[in-house]
């Protein structure tokens, strides 16, 4: 019997300082590039090693970016979203949604990574 997969959704404000090579991540999504079914939101698809986002440590692959410097990312074309990040300035405030997968296994089952084992 398989356990049910649930998601714990949290939001966080992340303030990044643009580094020498920029913010250091890739995005997918947009009204013309739906990465997630029925969702045209903007998602982080890659964190560049040693880039500003990686060094800060809070932004993760799979995070949904809700806004940049207070500007909502809803209903944007993919390239318009990219341009928004490029033109966001030196100090960049991101409102992000983290989605953590929580595995609810059958009663009595202990997962491989359970520290109590």
């Amino acid at each position: 019997m398989n356990g049910r997969v649930d998601y714990l959704v949290t939001e966080e404000e992340i303030n990044l300082t643009r580094g020498p090579s920029g913010l250091g991540f890739n995005i997918v999504g947009g009204t013309d590039q739906q990465y997630v079914s029925n969702d045209s939101g903007i998602y982080v698809s890659r964190i560049k090693e040693n880039g500003a986002a990686a060094l800060d440590g809070r932004l993760q692959e799979g995070d949904k970016i809700l806004s940049v410097n207070g500007q909502d990312l809803k209903n944007l074309l993919h390239q318009d979203a990219v341009d928004l990040f490029r033109n966001a300035g030196y100090a960049v405030s991101l409102r992000v949604q983290h989605r953590l997968q929580v595995q609810n296994g059958p009663i009595g089952h202990r997962g491989e990574g359970d520290p109590s084992g």
């Epitope: 920029g22 890739n26 997918v28 590039q33 698809s45 890659r46 560049k48 090693e49 990040f85």
Partner: nanobody
Framework: EVQLVESGGGLVQAGGSLRLSCAAS????????LGWFRQAPGKEREFVGT??????STADSVKGRFTISRDNAKNTVYLQMNSLKPEDTAVYYC?????????????????????WGQGTQVTVS
């Protein structure tokens, strides 16, 4: 995990043409940034060109001779090489990153790419 397989290399005379192909796995191929790089014996890996969601670009050394295109229905990216020169001799690699960089229109640094093919040899005599 994205897998890339290049094909189309070979031996060609100077002035000739070749078309390299790179077939990729993955259901979200259309979102990939795809690059071509090359490495000649004893030299560093060199950027050839890239294609993103918004367009394509090639290095100055091949501009006007090489073009990059993609077929999202076939999960394949192409490098059309015309007017080949002996100095184009190298192993050609396809590389991919998921999504668009928020920092660079056309990423040319190998570190911007996570997935690499095994390479295909191009020899121009």
């Amino acid at each position: 995990e994205v897998q890339l397989v290049e094909s189309g290399g070979g031996l060609v005379q100077a002035g000739g043409s070749l078309r390299l192909s790179c077939a990729a796995s993955g259901r979200t191929f259309s979102t990939y940034t795809l690059g071509w790089f090359r490495q000649a014996p004893g030299k560093e890996r060199e950027f050839v060109g890239t294609i993103t969601w918004s367009g394509s670009s090639t290095a100055d050394s091949v501009k006007g001779r090489f073009t990059i295109s993609r077929d999202n229905a076939k999960n394949t990216v192409y490098l059309q090489m015309n007017s080949l020169k002996p100095e184009d001799t190298a192993v050609y690699y396809c590389a991919a990153a998921i999504g668009s960089s928020v920092d660079s229109d056309y990423p040319s640094d190998p570190l911007e790419y996570d997935y690499w093919g095994q390479g295909t040899q191009v020899t121009v005599s």
